[in-house]
């Protein structure tokens, strides 16, 4: 969490941002809130990106003002116009690109004053893993698959029964480049699994950590998946 304050001229206002991550090819949110104003026409929101020649987005007098928007963001940005009046300056970024990563500044002007706060935005690819029993294998085998990851993650297997066990010798992980030549499909196979046990396939890079669990008993198979972004710090 980053909290910024205005410095000169009028009074300063508090602006708060939250570091976040974007999943390439999908839409992302750059979060920013500020002390609200009673008149929408008095609010100016500027989003800037470090090292970029134009603006990321500008909203003033109740509407977008995009004459100085940088071409790398053309047609890809929007604020939540109906929420600006209550202090929400968050930016929706469409079709997140790898090159959208960097330091952004949310700069606010209201009748009360000015303020800004920076946020770090990471980009990559992350997806939920699915763990299945591989019935084609000669021995009891589990197969963990996740369709889109970038940068290349690490994959670790764990077991509820054999806690602390190292499964690296009885597992095999491969990374297959997807058609867009950036993200990769992750496939990890765990051999010699035992029944009545819960196994976890944990995939992690510097952006996200995802876990796929599978519980195999003689009568049923239960699955559960979980994904957590690693860098959501507020400023």
């Amino acid at each position: 969490l980053i909290i910024g304050f205005g410095i000169s001229g009028r009074h300063s206002i508090t602006v708060t941002t939250v570091a976040s991550a974007g999943n390439i090819g999908e839409d992302g949110i750059l979060s920013c809130t500020f002390e609200p104003d009673i008149k929408l026409s008095d609010i100016v929101i500027q989003w800037l990106k470090e090292g970029v020649l134009g603006l990321v987005h500008e909203f003033k007098e109740g509407k977008d003002e995009l004459s100085e928007q940088d071409e790398m963001f053309r047609g890809r940005t929007a604020v939540f116009a109906d929420q600006v009046i209550v202090g929400n300056a968050s930016l929706r970024l469409k079709n997140v690109q790898l090159t959208d990563a960097g330091t952004y500044k949310c700069y606010i002007i209201t009748s009360k004053g000015k303020g800004n706060a920076n946020l770090e935005y990471k980009t990559g690819a992350f997806s939920m893993p699915e763990v299945n029993v591989d019935y084609n294998a000669s021995s009891e085998t589990l197969r963990c698959e996740a369709p889109r990851w970038f940068p290349q993650p690490t994959v670790v297997w764990a077991s509820q029964v054999d806690q602390g066990a190292n499964f690296s010798e009885v597992s095999n992980t491969s990374f297959e480049l997807n058609s867009e030549n950036v993200t990769m499909k992750v496939v990890s196979v765990l051999y010699n699994v035992t029944i009545n046990n819960t196994y976890s396939c944990m995939i992690e890079n510097d952006i996200a950590k995802a876990t796929g669990d599978i519980k195999v008993t003689e009568s049923e198979i239960k699955r559960r998946s979980h994904l957590q972004l690693l860098n959501s710090k507020a400023s």
Epitope: G54, E68, M72, T99
Partner: antibody, heavy 122, light 107 residues
């Protein structure tokens, strides 16, 4: 101390290619856009190209569009200008300059290299 | 692209004179204008940015004004080291454009 050091200039025939480099030090290179500016002998300054800090955006003057390519390697703190299909009118001293950090807020072109001479002649 | 036109192209002045150089943009560049000084055989040096902000270390005899399309660089009292060529530069669009330059010579 901020330093920019260009290299790679020289004599090249019309239609030929050349790659200029600019080694940067003394500042956080990836935080700044960078530009190339040229100056023909006895003439004024002409902006050639710029690139955003992360390298995701590139910008060119009409006179070089389609022939020149700007790039950067932030791990090496180095800016490049690949010049293809060179013409006599591309003869100039080429400067690299530190461009903007934050749009509308910061200085730009506050540091320049010493320049490297490119001569296009048969 | 925005075109920048400087006037005059050259001028002769004496030490102590007040010198004014103007720069006109073909379309509004708001306040996104810089002024540079260049001496023969040297790289340019930034004097003014954002139309009127003085770059750190630049003497206060240099000042800039204007917004939109019309801008002015003023040297309040010309010093011997100020004889050089001065360029305006817009940065209000993704391109950056320089004026053709104004050479300040000794009278």
């Amino acid at each position: 101390e901020v330093q920019l050091l260009e290299s790679g200039g020289g004599l090249v025939q019309p239609g030929g290619s050349l790659r200029l480099s600019c080694a940067a030090s003394g500042f956080t290179f990836s935080s700044y856009a960078m530009s190339w500016v040229r100056q023909a002998p006895g003439k004024g300054l002409e902006w050639v190209s710029a690139i955003s800090g992360g390298g995701g955006s590139t910008y060119y003057a009409d006179s070089v569009k389609g022939r020149f390519t700007i790039s950067r390697d932030n791990s090496k703190n180095t800016l490049y200008l690949q010049m293809n299909s060179l013409r006599a009118e591309d003869t100039a001293v080429y400067y690299c300059a530190r461009d903007i950090q934050w749009f509308g807020e910061s200085t730009l072109f506050d540091y320049w290299g010493q320049g490297t001479l490119v001569t296009v002649s048969s | 692209d925005i075109q920048m036109t400087q006037s005059p192209s050259s001028l002769s002045a004496s030490v102590g004179d007040r010198v004014t150089i103007t720069c006109r943009a073909s379309q509004s560049t708001r306040s996104w204008l810089a002024w540079h000084q260049q001496k023969p055989g040297k790289a340019p040096k930034l004097l003014i940015y954002k139309a009127s902000s003085l770059e750190s270390g630049v003497p206060s005899r240099f000042s800039g004004s204007g917004s939109g399309t019309d801008f002015t660089l003023t040297i309040s009292s010309l010093q011997p080291e100020d004889f050089a060529t001065y360029y305006c530069q817009q940065y209000g669009s993704y391109s950056r454009t320089f004026g053709q330059g104004t050479k300040v010579e000794i009278k």
